[in-house]
Amino acid sequence: KEVCYERLGCFSDDSPWSGITERPLHILPWSPKDVNTRFLLYTNENPNNFQEVAADSSSISGSNFKTNRKTRFIIHGFIDKGEENWLANVCKNLFKVESVNCICVDWKGGSRTGYTQASQNIRIVGAEVAYFVEFLQSAFGYSPSNVHVIGHSLGAHAAGEAGRRTNGTIGRITGLDPAEPCFQGTPELVRLDPSDAKFVDVIHTDGAPIVPNLGFGMSQVVGHLDFFPNGGVEMPGCKKNILSQIVDIDGIWEGTRDFAACNHLRSYKYYTDSIVNPDGFAGFPCASYNVFTANKCFPCPSGGCPQMGHYADRYPGKTNDVGQKFYLDTGDASNFARWRYKVSVTLSGKKVTGHILVSLFGNKGNSKQYEIFKGTLKPDSTHSNEFDSDVDVGDLQMVKFIWYNNVINPTLPRVGASKIIVETNVGKQFNFCSPETVREEVLLTLTPC
């Protein structure tokens, strides 16, 4: 079957849209009237209250839309709505760093139904966004390369459809945990893929299989750059007990959403935080997350590391290839940004069994204490570890060392760190030395060698 609409053209239930393994039911999308796609414009001039706009000259001219600015569309996913706080929060953070037309796309008319139907309705949403982009080009000479479409879940595939319909001329598409069911393993025509825009970046946060794990997001790479924070499956802070999850810092409703789909929603929270942390989400090229956590992918290569989220487009090699995979760790609650350091400690003093901890002090701030090693502490041995600090300490000025004994030793042995090397993710090294040794639980300050 096929259904046609005046502005948007025709939609068929033929393969690959339906009747394939991943989507066996022959279903057509609902009509544009029923999906009721709305465009809610926030700008630096109206950051708190949207202006509803349409692909119409008088509507655009009568709004705060500025043709000399970039335009970022944000498309929500299944069951969600365009007026939800998270979309406006993305816009508000954008206004802190740029002048921009920020358009939240509401399609709750088509998202609040069964999932299979909603997965077809995104074709209408994508067509509506494409129509809007083409209208801006024809009416105002606005280049599609100045358009960035950000889509969460089903919204990521709606963004892909908008990109496909505009022949890949859109500047950028960001997929925030693109939806897995009905999309993973399907032909590129159906789902988000790298040909949908000049640059496609993706954040995967809920990549467990839908059956039996209820992972809503894709594990499949679908962009030029695909980021897998915390491995892309289980996000830190998402395994709280029910009560503490629902009684959330952002309110009961956000807590309830988190309880239902915490990993899946993390993708837009990371993106939101990335806007105001330009270097806090460095993604490391690596064979797998297991290899990354084994400390084998540090520091960044000579070409640098891309930033997951808003600043991914600053990466020089962003379109060198498709399916480039990057790994990183985040925090377990907002602010999610982290700065990774490698610390190598060369020990002095007595041989003991215990824990060594280090804290970093720099011109931008100071870190917490981090455990570098636990086990046998032998003089002249060197122990290395990597950790993710919630503070960017800047250029290192000083390091503090402390150790704890595994056994209570009445002889009060002394241990020191003759040398500590700190390496930042860009490969910058700072060397610190001390001839001293200290008893356990006593801080030792190391200064530049």
């Epitope: 830190p236 760790d329 824990h355 993710d388």
Partner: nanobody, 120 residues
Amino acid sequence: QVQLQESGGGLVQAGGSLRLSCAASGTILSIIYMDWYRQTPGKQRELVGRITAGGSTNYADSAKGRFTISKDNAKNTVYLQMNSLKPEDTAVYYCNALITRWDKSVNDYWGQGTQVTVSS
């Protein structure tokens, strides 16, 4: 987030025994040490004893010979076995731990406390 929860407090007669538990929950890489403290109204908290990561223990003079600290690594739980209790042992008992979290950051954590009352 890491949390410490004490339990096992209550009312006991002089000469009796109580076993307090302190359970650490959250994503924990290691417990570097765990201390038991106690506090009576108007006084500062005093250290009762410590157990290290290796299971080594140390006690304040007031606890030596009567109190024993042990732990169950699998359950991230530390116990304070108190025997031959005296009225002067009446206090709120707190556990305190230095814990390495999932992200390798090391923080000091306190429990909410459990009341122990020894009647004469």
